[in-house]
């Protein structure tokens, strides 16, 4: 878990200032109003398959 400004959270997670740690974006399904969910919406997880142009 990284403090903001030092290194990003791992893929699929986002920094929570409220909890002072990286949190799983998956939990935004149950708790969409969590502060870190804004960061999840901005950087959605990569799709299962990359679609080539």
């Amino acid at each position: 878990e990284q403090a903001p400004g030092t290194a990003p959270c791992s893929r699929g997670s986002s920094w929570s200032a409220d909890l002072d740690k990286c949190m799983d974006c998956a939990s935004c399904r149950a708790r969409p109003h969590s502060d870190f969910c804004l960061g999840c919406a901005a950087a959605p997880p990569a799709p299962f398959r990359l679609l080539w142009p």
Partner: antibody, heavy 119, light 111 residues
């Protein structure tokens, strides 16, 4: 260090009541959903009840097997979780675990407290 | 309610073996992005411990020999090289909806 410490278990007769407590420390208790999970002797895990946050009006959910008999509650000012168990049956005999989680996966577990329902 | 079927219910293995445990849900527990399936380890007389959440996310402090995979209804927990401390019972659990349900458990014993 995260700690969940259950208490209140013991021997009770069928039809009796018991109140379990769970004292939490080491995490922001008021931000975490809490549940009770039980395990009958030699058996698997069974989710019993859940309580959410003040912002959710302390919404509660129960397994069908305990609905109407058990009541989950919390006191955020005391970092404590409770389970009031009424009309106890032999099949309620189990180790009861207090669990804490932000959502979904149960990150934090207590050591458990044994409830024995027998005459 | 969603039923969780774990297999096998028990297995015997040796230190260094690759071990695979499967869990099947009676309906999908995945969205297009995430799977709401989690794995726990329990040793005798102890509380369960979270190993993997959201099907494949290793919990902090859990050795990298543990891995999880799967989506929809079929999920797998793999221990790449079994260590003496891994002999325990493993449970899957979904959090797709209330009630949360656990698999029946898989006891990993020493051969």
């Amino acid at each position: 260090e995260v700690q969940l410490v259950e208490s209140g278990g013991g021997l009770v007769q069928p039809g009796g009541s018991l109140r379990l407590s769970c004292a939490a420390s080491g995490f922001t208790f008021s931000s975490y959903w809490m549940s009770w999970v039980r395990q009958a002797p030699g058996k698997g895990l069974e989710w019993v009840a859940e309580i959410r946050l003040k912002s959710d009006n302390y919404a509660t959910h129960y397994a069908e097997s305990v609905k109407g008999r058990f009541t989950i509650s919390r006191d955020d000012s005391k970092n404590s979780l409770y389970l009031q168990m009424n009309s106890l049956r032999a099949e309620d005999t189990a180790v009861y675990y207090c669990t804490g989680y932000y959502a979904d996966a149960m990150d934090y577990w207590g050591q458990g407290t044994l409830v024995t329902v027998s005459s | 309610d969603i039923q969780m079927t774990q297999s096998p219910s028990s297995l015997s293995a040796s230190v260094g073996d690759r071990v695979t445990i499967t869990c099947r849900a009676s309906q999908s527990v995945s969205t297009s992005s995430y799977s709401y399936m989690h794995w726990y380890q329990q040793k005798p007389g102890k509380a369960p411990k979270l190993l993997i959440k959201y099907a494949s996310n290793l919990e902090s402090g859990v050795p990298s020999r543990f891995s999880g995979s799967g989506s929809g209804t079929d999920f797998t927990l793999t221990i790449s090289s079994l260590q003496p401390e891994d002999f325990a019972t493993y449970y899957c659990q979904h959090s797709w909806e209330i009630p949360y349900t656990f698999g029946g458990g898989t006891k990993v014993e020493i051969k």
